[in-house]
């Protein structure tokens, strides 16, 4: 047993038929010593008397808020909440495998640029009693500060008969060093706790990594003169780092007729503009990506070509 | 060229052959590894990979300081993947082909070096691992792992160029 | 803590194949990488291979190649060890070991000397 | 094949004395690439000592090991009544990685 935060304890137990369960002792914080009772929940019910309360751990059934009273006066409060173990792997019931970028990924996250700022987000299919905490640092042995917010839901779905909760988080490094090589990896454990059942979570990146920036911005084209040739260009989304001269991206153009069946033409370029041919009814697409460390294109920014 | 007394380096020069190095190196290893990242060993082990840190003077504001700290930092890099490179852990079996993407990543961190430091001045560098693996997997690994962080280097000192080369240059 | 927790005693005949699984529990698992050794009654410790870890393959003993296969699934932590064509001589107490982790440079890997043991499963081949 | 050889295949000794194993090898091993184990009856082996004289965590600075090329020792300085048990070595330099034959440490 362990505690989670003030008066909430995690009991970690073997989940299989019959398992013996673990003996938790729980102790009324209180100077009295005499006429204690202790209940569950909202049970009247008393389960024993005395300053300690002896209980076997088995199942949901056994966690709870434990209540210590005196002369119909609240003493104090212990919720036991379970952490399952099933064949010698912690349960992870609360969250959807995610599967992407590969299978057991329960937890993803991005970054827009190398300012130390991420997000964090998670999948559930489960809509209430539902809370989450997060914690982040880099490096585990001698860990460096990251300040992580609230998680909030940030978006809801419908996949086929079910509803799906997506939730996330932002997290900041404090001492951030943008042009530093990473060689500690960033370390993110959410706690998840829906209604008594206790599971966390966790992912270990690089920012290099997870690095997404946001697509190109202010896309323009300007006809060529006496040509069906047109001169694209686009600005840095203004959520990258800078200086761009240090941070720098390549980008894709790339032209795309009305069906997805028409051959895609694609140019790569370090700069701001580009020149294309523009087919009637396509448009023109561009994304962006870190210049010298191949982590994800962006989003495309998109025009029409008319 | 980086020379004593703190002139300085070619940077045009260095910002062309270190774009190249990144594109060499994730030719070399194009996975995004999904590699463990936590590189914990056993008590007594020590990490001694050069790394570009934050006190190195490689942000732009340090390089319009003094660039020669950041300089001697990537050198030092340099050379250490360079002598990687060319180790048993890259020259034992599995064998790779003479033109592999490694060789060619080889011969570039070298030539980076050279642009870096003429002959006859020698700035300090890292001394490579001794104790090395004995079986071909065991070498696969470690070169899966090293070209890993080569790529987030050779990303930074690319950086570092380009930033130079647009700004620091005469 | 990390243990290793292997599957019970098997009795074979002649012929048949047999498969031991070897749980890991606590750490993480893609960075264990488990060896298999097996010791015949009274005798000394053979070593017949290492189940696959990121990026590398299956590696046997020459002695073992074509009669063992050995995998690893990393979603329920689990390493297994197939050995077939059983002869009686392949009685023996089957052991997994964790490859104690050597350092080159900043980068580990493992080394063939083994920190941490299964408590052994004993397969008996007999007609 | 790399054979090692140990000797004595037992050895009797008292609490308190000094033990010296030895490991011979049929060819030169790089001493990055010996270990030695100990086993008790019904267990399985633990590792003592890896790169011929690094002891592994936990284990008694009583151990000690040496050698190099096709020489090796294990010395257990003064012995304790759990020390009486099986001792291998290993040698991870080529495959495949072999074990010695065991030196027993028995109760004189």
């Known amino acids: 047993i362990w505690e989670l935060k003030k008066d909430v304890y995690v009991v970690e137990l073997d989940w299989y038929p019959d398992a013996p369960g673990e003996m938790v002792v729980l102790t009324c914080d209180t100077p009295e010593e005499d006429g204690i009772t202790w209940t569950l929940d909202q049970s009247s019910e008393v389960l024993g008397s005395g300053k300690t309360l002896t209980i076997q751990v088995k199942e949901f059934g056994d966690a709870g808020q434990y209540t210590c009273h005196k002369g119909g006066e609240v003493l104090s409060h212990s919720l036991l909440l379970l952490h399952k173990k099933e064949d010698g792997i912690w349960s992870t019931d609360i969250l959807k495998d995610q599967k992407e970028p590969k299978n057991k990924t329960f937890l993803r996250c991005e970054a827009k640029n190398y300012s130390g700022r991420f997000t964090c987000w998670w999948l559930t299919t489960i809509s209430t009693d539902l809370t989450f905490s997060v914690k982040s640092s880099r490096g585990s042995s001698d860990p460096q500060g990251v300040t992580c917010g609230a998680a909030t839901l940030s978006a809801e779905r419908v996949r086929g008969d079910n509803k799906e909760y997506e939730y996330s988080v932002e997290c900041q490094e404090d001492s951030a060093c943008p042009a530093a090589e990473e060689s500690l990896p960033i370390e993110v454990m959410v706690d998840a706790v829906h209604k008594l059942k206790y599971e966390n979570y966790t992912s270990s990146f690089f920012i290099r990594d997870i690095i997404k920036p946001d697509p190109p911005k202010n896309l323009q084209l300007k006809p060529l003169k006496n040509s069906r040739q047109v001169e694209v260009s686009w600005e840095y989304p203004d959520t990258w780092s800078t200086p761009h001269s240090y941070f720098s991206l390549t980008f894709c153009v790339q032209v795309q007729g009305k069906s997805k069946r028409e051959k895609k033409d694609r140019v790569f370029t370090d700069k701001t503009s580009a020149t294309v041919i523009c087919r009637k009814n396509a448009s023109i697409s561009v994304r962006a990506q870190d210049r010298y460390y191949s982590s994800s294109w962006s989003e495309w920014a998109s025009v029409p070509c008319s | 060229r980086a020379v004593p007394g703190g002139s300085s380096p070619a940077w045009t020069q260095c910002q062309q052959l270190s774009q190249k190095l990144c594109t060499l190196a994730w030719s070399a290893h194009p996975l995004v590894g999904h590699m463990d990242l936590r590189e914990e060993g056993d008590e007594e082990t020590t990490n001694d990979v050069p790394h570009i840190q934050c006190g190195d003077g490689c942000d732009p504001q340090g390089l319009r300081d003094n660039s020669q700290f950041c300089l001697q930092r990537i050198h030092q890099g340099l050379i250490f993947y360079e002598k990687l490179l060319g180790s048993d852990i890259f020259t034992g079996e599995p064998s790779l082909l003479p033109d592999s993407p490694v060789a060619q990543l080889h011969a570039s961190l070298l030539g980076l070096s050279q642009l870096l430091q003429p002959e006859g001045h020698h700035w300090e560098t890292q001394q490579i691992p001794s104790l090395s693996p004995s079986q071909p997997w065991q070498r696969l690994l470690l070169r899966f792992k090293i070209l890993r962080s080569l790529q987030a280097f050779v990303a930074v000192a690319a950086r570092v160029f380009a930033h130079g080369a647009a700004t620091l240059s005469p | 803590q990390v243990e290793l927790v292997q599957s019970g005693a098997e009795v074979k005949k002649p012929g048949s194949s047999v498969k031991v699984s070897c749980k890991a529990s606590g750490g993480t698992f893609s960075s264990n990488y488990i060896s298999w050794v097996r010791q015949a009654p009274g005798q000394g410790l053979e070593w017949m291979g290492i189940?696959?870890?990121?990026?590398?393959?299956?590696y046997y003993a020459q002695k073992f190649q074509g009669r063992v296969t050995i995998t690893a699934d990393e979603s329920t932590s689990t390493a297994y060890m197939e050995l077939s064509s059983l002869r009686s001589e392949d009685t023996a107490v089957y052991y997994c070991a964790r490859s104690k982790k050597g350092m080159y440079g900043g980068w580990t890997y493992p080394l063939m000397m083994f920190d941490l043991w299964g408590q052994g499963t004993l397969v008996t081949v007999s007609s | 094949d790399i054979v090692l050889t140990q000797s004595p295949a037992t050895l009797s000794l008292s609490p308190g004395e000094r033990a010296t194993l030895s490991c011979r090898a049929s060819?030169?091993?790089?001493?990055?690439?010996l270990a030695w184990y100990q086993q008790k009856p019904g267990q399985a082996p633990r590792l003592l000592i890896y790169?011929?004289?690094r002891r592994a965590t936990g284990v008694p600075a009583r151990f000690s090991g040496s050698g190099s090329g096709t020489d090796f020792t294990l010395t257990i300085s003064s012995l304790e009544p759990e020390d009486f048990a099986t001792y291998y070595c290993?040698?991870?330099?080529?495959?495949?990685?072999?074990f010695g034959q065991g030196t027993k440490v028995e109760i004189k």
């Open positions: 290993q040698q991870t330099s080529n495959t495949p990685f072999t």
């Open positions: 790169y011929a004289s």
């Open positions: 060819q030169s091993v790089s001493s990055n690439y």
């Open positions: 189940s696959p870890g990121t990026g590398i393959n299956a």
